[in-house]
């Protein structure tokens, strides 16, 4: 006999919620795998800045995305399938995963706060690599997409360490329309905007982390309530 009433409502709420979560994970994983295995992005491994080999921040970022996408898909599947099948085992595993993820998020939050300067440096390095790839390999549409995402999200363009050719390509092709780069290249420096984000606007990242944590707690409660509802319904 299946669950009834309010518990049934929780069942479908958990299903819908985790299905969206699973889809989002799939999108993230798909994009990350595309970036990782696309020949144009792979060129980043062999890219050189003058005489120095390029750092691999780009790849570290992609591997993090792959891991996040895979975990999201796995956890989403557990929640989805566990809810629809009314499986105490799957829901228990789902709850355990959420507890682990919650602990990871808290640990990552503490680590991130302590290492915010290093993270900002890595994000800047990631931007620089994507920008360099977009200029050197002018067919690298994924690198261009990364650069344009930075420019549009942070409302910036370029940095104070640009080469001549990069400046020219930026001005003519990769800067957001109406950007002040034309009148003064360094008015909207992306490096500065990244620094601002990790110092002055750190609370935004904090709010986002709290929202994710609240959703996790909400899902934990729902999965436990549903698990108890399933146990109770199987008694009768």
């Amino acid at each position: 006999m299946g669950v009834e009433g309010c518990t049934k409502c929780i069942k479908y709420l958990l299903f819908v919620f985790n299905f969206v979560f699973w889809l989002a994970g799939g999108v993230i994983l798909g994009v990350a795998l595309w970036l990782r295995h696309d020949p144009q992005t792979t060129n980043l491994l062999y890219l050189e800045l003058g005489d120095k080999p390029a750092p691999n921040t780009f790849y570290v970022g992609i591997y993090i995305l792959i891991a996040v996408g895979a975990v999201m898909m796995f956890v989403g599947f557990l929640g989805c399938y566990g809810a629809i099948q009314e499986s105490q085992c799957l829901l228990g595993t789902f709850f355990t995963c959420l507890v682990i993820l919650f602990a990871c998020e808290v640990a990552a939050g503490i680590w991130g706060f302590v290492n915010k300067d290093q993270i900002a440096k890595d994000v800047k390095q990631f931007y620089d690599q994507a920008l360099q790839q977009a200029v050197v390999d002018d067919d690298a549409n994924n690198a261009k997409a990364v650069v344009k995402t930075f420019h549009e999200t942070l409302d910036c363009c370029g940095s104070s360490t640009l080469t001549a050719i990069t400046t020219s390509v930026l001005k003519n092709n990769l800067c957001p329309s109406g950007s002040n780069i034309i009148s003064n290249l360094f008015k909207e420096d992306c490096h500065q905007k990244i620094d601002d984000l990790f110092s002055g606007k750190l609370y935004l990242i904090g709010i986002a982390a709290i929202v994710v944590a609240v959703i996790m707690i909400f899902e934990m409660i729902l999965s436990m309530v549903l698990c108890c509802g399933i146990r109770n319904s199987s008694v009768y």
Partner: antibody
């Protein structure tokens, strides 16, 4: 050895057209930005245009914008400059140059081809 | 009138040290764009002499050196030789004009 060889220069009347070519060898042409730089007789150097490795990006000096067009054929390792509506002030030796991304400059130059615009 | 200003001529005797200046502005050399130097021997194409303010490509003698300070750059030639007689051009990028800019050129004469 890196080699760049320009051709196509000559005498042309004002308002006329000319197409310059630059045959290259000794380096991976298809992965390099290329450029044209000119030098009027007895004068200094003036950058004219550049084109990216796959022709996605290009730019021109204001003095030639709308009249000159840069292009390349990577299968032939050749760079081109289509010059239309030529003026007397376009008279110059036109050099094709490889643009080095790492060094951010023109690291190899051809010997140049003379374009004379006169009636 | 060139965006980068160079003296039109310079001279020296063999063995002497000669310096050629290149003055720009805050939109080119002063904006952090590297200065490069080219040597053009009579009747030939320009040849890269110094890149990135002070680096020498392989094959360029260490008699040639470059430096940059603020909105200016300079090329120094020590132990001057007769084969150094040529035109020297400085080059940078101007962010306001969005063009690669060259100096007007300096004609170096080796006396005696």
């Amino acid at each position: 050895e890196v080699q760049l060889l320009e051709s196509g220069g000559g005498l042309v009347q004002p308002g006329g057209s000319l197409r310059l070519s630059c045959a290259t060898s000794g380096f991976p042409f298809s992965s390099n930005y290329m450029s044209w730089v000119r030098q009027a007789p007895g004068k200094g150097l003036e950058w004219v245009s550049y084109i990216s490795s796959s022709s996605t990006y290009s730019d021109y000096a204001d003095s030639v914008k709308g009249r000159f067009s840069i292009s390349r054929d990577n299968s032939k390792n050749t760079l081109y400059l289509q010059m239309n509506s030529l003026r007397a002030e376009d008279t110059a030796v036109y050099y094709c140059a490889r643009y080095s991304y790492g060094r951010d400059n023109f690291d190899y130059w051809g010997q140049g081809t003379l374009v004379t615009v006169s009636s | 009138q060139s965006v980068l200003t160079q003296p039109s001529s310079a001279s020296g005797t063999p063995g002497q040290r000669v310096t050629i200046s290149c003055t720009g502005s805050t939109s080119n050399i002063g904006a952090g764009y590297a200065t490069h130097w080219y040597q053009q021997l009579p009747g030939t194409a320009p040849k890269l002499l110094i890149y990135g303010n002070s680096n020498r490509p392989s094959g360029v003698p260490d008699r040639f050196s470059g430096s940059k300070s603020g909105t200016s750059a300079s090329l120094a030639i020590s132990g001057l030789r007769s084969e150094d007689e040529a035109d020297y051009y400085c080059q940078s990028y101007d962010t306001n004009l969005s063009v690669w800019v060259f100096g007007g050129g300096t004609k170096l004469t080796v006396l005696g």
